[in-house]
């Protein structure tokens, strides 16, 4: 015997209180598939969350984050604070990258400068808090006196994190 609820389309629910009639989802709720016995409550984008897409009877609302924050997690389940380039977010707030590390984005962690010498290359442009070093040709490729080779910067040592 076919379940009468299977005929209820998305945007409705099978109302047991009304002889399994397909009733439209109430305001601020939705059903994204047919045959549902209840409608789900729409997500509310509150606080730092902003509405990217309004809830409809067949699909949930979608949120993003207010300026100065970015989404984390599936479906933007969290908002995380942006920092400036050259910083990383810690539990003490935004902190400058330690010497020898950089971050060229407003999110994420500071990463160690590239160690050019590991590839047998020299440092062409020194690194900063915001930019990685630029490696140049290997010292053997340089004619004598053509360039001064900067020693590679140390990678971040344990305990030097701003946390």
């Amino acid at each position: 015997l076919q379940d009468p609820c299977s005929n209820c389309p998305a945007g409705t629910f099978c109302d047991n209180n009304r002889n399994q009639i397909c009733s439209p989802c109430p305001p601020n709720s939705f059903s994204s598939a047919g045959g549902q016995r209840t409608c789900d409550i729409c997500r509310q984008c509150k606080g730092v969350f902003r509405t990217r897409k309004e809830c409809s009877s067949t699909s949930n609302a979608e949120c993003d984050c207010t300026p100065g924050f970015h989404c984390l997690g599936a479906g933007c389940s969290m908002c995380e604070q942006d920092c400036k380039q050259g910083q990383e977010l810690t539990k003490k707030g935004c902190k400058d990258c330690c010497f020898g590390t950089f971050n060229d984005q407003k999110r994420g962690i500071c990463r160690p400068w590239t160690n050019c010498s590991l590839d047998g290359k020299s440092v062409l442009v020194n690194g900063t808090k915001e930019r990685d070093v630029v490696c140049g040709p290997s010292p053997a490729d340089l004619s004598p006196g053509a360039s001064s080779v900067t020693p590679p910067a140390p990678a971040r040592e344990p305990g030097h994190s701003p946390q």
Epitope: G47, V48, L72, G73, S77, M78, C79, E80, Q81, L89, T90, K91
Partner: nanobody
Framework: EVQLVESGGGLVKPGGSLRLSCAAS????????MIWYRQAPGEELEWVAN????????YYVDSVKGRFTISRDNATNSLFLQMNSLRAEDTAVYYC????????????????WGQGTTVTVSS
């Protein structure tokens, strides 16, 4: 329903004090980091302070250090912000927020926010 409700804002003269409260419900309050943010008129949200689950770790933005104190009472599911020596530049809407699962471990994301309480510092 997971909810945060702030209270305690108001109009205060420079040099005055206010104590903001944030009542949490619908989740196990003691399992989460909690955070205060503020938004001055026309400005982006600014992190003010945060506190870990048992209150043993507290951090503040430089501009409020020595003047503001964050605290919590896990028995009553409450977060507080004691604000002393208030200045005109502290005028803002203050929000409490819940740190998401993994806060201070894998990320610093917030997943629940209150509606905010307005603090106005003016003579």
């Amino acid at each position: 329903e997971v909810q945060l409700v702030e209270s305690g804002g108001g109009l205060v003269k420079p040099g005055g004090s206010l104590r903001l409260s944030c009542a949490a419900s619908g989740f196990t309050f003691s399992n989460y980091w909690m955070i205060w943010y503020r938004q001055a008129p026309g400005e982006e949200l600014e992190w003010v302070a945060n506190i870990n689950q048992d209150g043993s770790e507290k951090y503040y933005v430089d501009s409020v250090k020595g003047r503001f104190t964050i605290s919590r009472d896990n028995a009553t599911n409450s977060l507080f912000l004691q604000m002393n020596s208030l200045r005109a530049e502290d005028t803002a809407v203050y929000y409490c927020a819940r740190g998401g699962d993994g806060y201070s471990n894998s990320h610093y994301g917030m997943d629940v926010w209150g509606q905010g309480t307005t603090v106005t510092v003016s003579s």
